[in-house]
Amino acid sequence: DAHKSEVAHRFKDLGEENFKALVLIAFAQYLQQCPFEDHVKLVNEVTEFAKTCVADESAENCDKSLHTLFGDKLCTVATLRETYGEMADCCAKQEPERNECFLQHKDDNPNLPRLVRPEVDVMCTAFHDNEETFLKKYLYEIARRHPYFYAPELLFFAKRYKAAFTECCQAADKAACLLPKLDELRDEGKASSAKQRLKCASLQKFGERAFKAWAVARLSQRFPKAEFAEVSKLVTDLTKVHTECCHGDLLECADDRADLAKYICENQDSISSKLKECCEKPLLEKSHCIAEVENDEMPADLPSLAADFVESKDVCKNYAEAKDVFLGMFLYEYARRHPDYSVVLLLRLAKTYETTLEKCCAAADPHECYAKVFDEFKPLVEEPQNLIKQNCELFEQLGEYKFQNALLVRYTKKVPQVSTPTLVEVSRNLGKVGSKCCKHPEAKRMPCAEDYLSVVLNQLCVLHEKTPVSDRVTKCCTESLVNRRPCFSALEVDETYVPKEFNAETFTFHADICTLSEKERQIKKQTALVELVKHKPKATKEQLKAVMDDFAAFVEKCCKADDKETCFAEEGKKLVAASQAALGL
């Protein structure tokens, strides 16, 4: 349904408030270094222009595409060349190349200062003084640090952010009310950002087919009572939504997401019995709720897949007639029967089935050739099961911090070329799989753990892509989306790595460590651990444990000392010498 003016269409559909918020997010995700005030000015100009188009869709420039309008606006920024360097070259291009160019310059790890949370009274005053600016600032700061954040979901976060301040700034104990809510929003926000980053990587690096396969598997697990045709329709619509958001088309994305939520709620009887509560909520909450809804119960009676996918004489005929539809049906039927499998495992099984059919349907006796295809599934199923069992046992034995340390050592030995901050960040997140998933019963562990690991390893992949330093990381990240985790799991110690030169400065600590939060202190210690492994990759677990225990004792001792700085200087030298001796450096 073509509209004379796309910008007027979206303004009317979304309303002024959402329109302005989404344009701000879009601009902040593209120009991540620009000051807040500049973005607000650009957004106001676009909004005023949109209003003229609403009044008269035939007015000058109202027929231009959103990419053209937004791109032209971004290219008016005076400091583009000095702030962004070669990104300014994008402005010499025509659409759609210009937008592609902007997308390529999105930075997953922008050089921005860490967000420091002010005192609660300071925040509440700012909130009361100018609520609108306060909330816009939130959108801006999140969007520029997370350039692939799912924009309609960020509107939902902003709504919760506003609700937290509205409630807590009136409370007797503002801090006790507000801080836990802000912590929760921060943690959920990071998780949401990382999940969306994987969706965008899937679409951009592996194509629409890969994303659709993921969506078929996940939606079939979630809606096992829905017919294949219904799941296929939802997959098509969901793919459009995420393609738009990942492509920077945030207005279209938010509009289409709202339409999809409306469709799902209007057709919930043929989709899932679990949607009732979600569908009673307002739009932003409704969409979020649907995205997180629990799996529906499986239909009472589902036959073995063998009849249709192995024993039928028509397997090759059905496959040849419509390969992707047949494979989609296989994936749908398998996934709705296996909510206990990770999506990536289901995709590996479907890939194995596809490979088998490709080979066997060209053979002399196809049926004989593919008759035992499900025997090939057994090792694929058992590998993640065993890995999760072993790692959950290790987690239960060590606790989260020490489990993270075990992973830090493991991954530093696998890919020692990767930067220390990245190794620390990724290994800490990998280690969180323990507290996140090991508490679940067996039937929920694999989907929780392996699909979470896919999200975390994607963080490693996107950070590494910015500055590639390891062929092994590049190989695991680019060869197969669904085999990334098995690829990293299979990596052994990198024997080609030349140990890093010892630098005493790396292991010099000061009294400021004493005032850090427990989390920050852990990160300091984990940074030192990674550096130790980079200096001595062949160090045993026992050696590393001894050095880390000494290090923890040293920090504790000096933080209790009267003259902390002197203690850190003198005891630090002794610790470095003792550590070198212990590790044979």
Partner: nanobody, 124 residues
């Protein structure tokens, strides 16, 4: 946790019949695909028959099709295997199994709980 106990095994002549039962406790079996497997001395465990959650679908190994019938009574939390026209090659330890989630009824890795087995000997 589901505990499974098989019964009904014994010695029978070729051409004879036996009915195996598998009684479940600890959980209701209506949410499980139920299967029978067997293991002959010195051989690998092999699939015999399976039945879907409410009994609407049954599935058999080629070697027992037309001779064996699997059935279930969810109200009694019990699964049965009626074995007719028994042959010496049916001699084995017969195991009952329960699978919460199962796409391939014939695959042992898709079953979560197993009984201890009941011995069937077909001999003249």
């Amino acid at each position: 946790e589901v505990q499974l106990v098989e019964s009904g095994g014994g010695v029978v002549q070729p051409g004879g019949s036996l009915r195996l039962s598998c009684a479940a406790s600890g959980s209701t079996i209506s949410s499980y695909v139920m299967g029978w497997f067997r293991q002959a001395p010195g051989k690998e465990r092999e699939f015999v028959a399976a039945i879907s959650r409410s009994g609407g679908y049954t599935y058999y190994a080629d070697s027992v099709k037309g001779r064996f019938t699997i059935s279930r009574d969810n109200s009694k939390n019990t699964v049965y295997l009626q074995m007719n026209s028994l042959r010496p090659e049916d001699t084995a330890l017969y195991y009952c199994a329960a699978g919460r989630y199962s796409a391939w009824y014939s695959q042992s890795y898709e079953y979560d709980y197993w009984g201890q087995g009941t011995l069937v000997t077909v001999s003249s």
